[in-house]
């Protein structure tokens, strides 16, 4: 690259500096004598005057300027020549230096290549040695493998002969198994036949038992009727004897009215003279449809129609709407009489409801409602209760006012949940409420902290599952 700079040194002389690449050249030029001093009135930067200069002065000044210009031109020519000469020398020197430098580099590269080649040769020699060692090793291994293969071949031959022996044994065993299978299938067939025969026998026995049960119930009723008839006969005989012995006796006997043969509830049965607790047949009001119920003729004067009973967990109370409507279980044990019958019965006359409870510690309590009735199915058998007395809590554990009945398949409660599914059993759930006598049955020592047990909060508190419960109804005017 080139650079040209003009400056003035400390003595006031002008100097020119030329820089070309890494080299710089400085030239000091001689001053011209004809130059005016700065005190001249005609200095180049003097202010122009209004009056014109003399002609002679102008001519003289032009000559002086021409001389100066010529001098400068010569100097510039010399300078140019000098620069060109010097540049040529410099270029030659630079080229020589470059060649020398390149030669040195080439020698260095050559040396380096020789060194690398020598190193590579040494490496190759080492690799060759390693390959030879490896080859030798592999040959030894091949020899060992060959020996091993021979041994394995022998072992395989031995094993093959063993397998053949085993196959022979297997065939023998298979034959034995086939023989045993044949025998077993014969035995199974015989057992199946016996099972079928037993099933037939069981079904026959079941029907016989059913018949016997019916006969037993009939016999019980008949027995009660016979007892009543006997009692009546004795009374008649006594009255006849009295009449006969009386001097003013009339020879006429009042004709008894026809015996009542159908009963609406257990109170009617009790009043008819049948005062033994047991199973009786009741007839739906204004209908010929019959239903079997347990009549408690002992508690509190008797005449109670039992509508619910729990005692041992033998009956599943997680039932459908239809089952709770029609009733389920056995009147001799755990059972639900049926919502439809109770609804019809309590809709005709005023009934009281008595609930008897037993805990696992041998305690008993009861709640008595002086008015109880169930609405019809169209109102989901809603319960209505008033007038609570008794020992099983001062507050009613059946929510007031009465709730609709709910079952696992008919959710009519006031809860965001489904109480019947959560608590188990059909009941007059609220949300879900302080009671559920149709909950899951839990045995002793497993009956606390239960979310779905047999619950009567205002007697035993939450989570306590009771041992036994009985719900019974009787006419209020009994």
């Amino acid at each position: 690259y080139s650079n040209f700079r003009k400056s003035v040194d400390s003595t006031g002389r002008r100097q020119y500096q030329v820089q070309n690449g890494p080299c710089s050249y400085t030239f000091l030029l001689p001053e011209t004598d004809s130059c005016r001093s700065s005190s001249s009135p005609y200095m180049s930067n003097a202010v122009q005057r209004d009056a014109p200069l003399d002609y002679d002065d102008s001519v003289q000044r032009l000559q002086v300027l021409e001389n100066i210009l010529e001098n400068n031109t010569q100097w510039l020519m010399k300078l140019e020549n000098y620069i060109q000469d010097n540049m040529k020398k410099e270029m030659v020197e630079i080229q020589q230096n470059v060649v020398q430098n390149q030669t040195a580099v080439m020698i260095e590269i050559g040396t380096s290549l020789l060194n690398q080649t020598a190193a590579q040769t040494r490496k190759l020699t080492d690799v060759e040695a390693q390959v030879l060692n490896q080859t030798t090793r592999l040959e030894l291994q091949l020899l060992q493998h060959s020996i091993s293969t021979n041994k394995l071949e022998k072992q395989i031959l031995d094993q093959t002969s063993e397998i053949n022996k085993l196959q022979n044994k297997n065939s023998f065993l298979e034959q034995k198994v086939l023989d045993m299978e044949g025998k077993h299938s014969e035995q199974l067939q015989s057992m199946k036949e016996q099972k079928d025969e037993l099933q037939v026998l069981v079904s026959k026995q079941s029907s016989v038992i059913d018949e016997l049960e019916k006969k037993l119930v009939t016999a019980t009723v008949n027995n009660s009727l016979l007892q009543k008839q006997q009692h009546d006969l004795m009374e008649t005989v006594n009255s006849l004897l009295t009449m006969m012995s009386s001097p003013n006796s009339k020879s006429s006997v009042a004709i008894r009215k026809e015996e009542q043969t159908t009963f609406r509830d257990c109170a009617e049965i009790f009043k008819s003279g049948l005062t033994t607790s047991g199973i009786y047949t009741l007839t739906f009001p204004n209908s010929t449809e019959e239903i079997k119920a347990y009549c408690d003729m002992d508690v509190g004067g008797g005449g109670w129609t039992v509508i619910q009973h729990r005692e041992d967990g033998s009956v599943d109370f997680q039932r459908t709407w239809k089952e709770y409507k029609e009733g389920f279980g056995s009147p001799l044990g755990e059972y639900w009489l049926g919502n439809e019958f109770v609804s019809q019965l309590t809709g005709q006359h005023r009934y009281v409801l008595k609930i008897q409870l037993k805990d696992w510690e041998g305690n008993e309590a009861h709640s008595l409602y002086d008015h109880f009735y169930l609405a019809g199915e169209e109102s989901n058998y809603r319960i209505h209760l008033t007038g609570l007395t008794g020992t099983a809590g001062k507050i009613s554990s059946i929510s007031q006012p009465g709730s609709d009945f709910s079952t696992k398949d008919s959710d009519n409660d006031k809860c965001i949940c489904k109480c019947s599914q959560m608590l188990s059993g059909g009941w007059w759930f609220d949300a879900c409420g302080p009671s559920n006598l149709n909950g899951q049955y839990y045995p002793q020592k497993q009956n606390t902290n239960k979310f779905n047990g047999i619950k009567w909060y205002y007697w035993k508190g939450s989570g306590y599952s009771l041992k036994a419960t009985t719900m019974m109804i009787r006419p209020a005017d009994f």
């Epitope: 809860c415 949300a431 239960k450 909060y457 939450s462 989570g463």
Partner: nanobody, 129 residues
């Protein structure tokens, strides 16, 4: 079987603090609401506070609002009742109890006492100088 075990009760001076714990087993807190109840001698059991872990909802009786704080740690299956600024009338046996979270009446936020079917044995808190 469901079990609830209370701890943390004791004797404390008026203005003092106590933290009760209720360790629950046999159920998961996500599906249940846990309530704290108390019963002073000769008085009926009353609700103090309750929590539904699933939604983080809490309930406080007016008598303890601003003083008691209920919280739960589902990983430990434990519910806590932090009781500050205790008064002599806070003296009682404190019980924790559980109820299935869904057993709620339409339109209601909390549960009557009879819906809580699982109970602990209680821990005595006595506030006296």
């Amino acid at each position: 079987d469901v079990q609830l075990v209370e701890s943390g009760g004791g004797l404390v001076q008026p203005g003092g603090s106590l933290r009760l714990s209720c360790a629950v087993s046999g159920i998961t807190l996500d599906d249940y609401a846990i309530g704290w109840f108390r019963q002073a001698p000769g008085k009926e059991r009353e609700g103090v506070s309750a929590i539904r872990s699933s939604g983080g909802s809490t309930y406080y009786a007016d008598s303890v609002k601003g003083r008691f704080t209920i919280s739960s740690d589902n990983s430990k299956n434990t519910v806590y009742l932090q009781m500050n600024s205790l008064r002599p009338e806070d003296t009682a046996v404190y019980y924790c109890a559980a109820v299935p979270a869904g057993r709620l009446r339409y339109g209601e936020q909390w549960y009557p006492i009879y819906e809580y079917d699982a109970w602990g044995q209680g821990t005595l808190v006595t506030v006296s100088s």
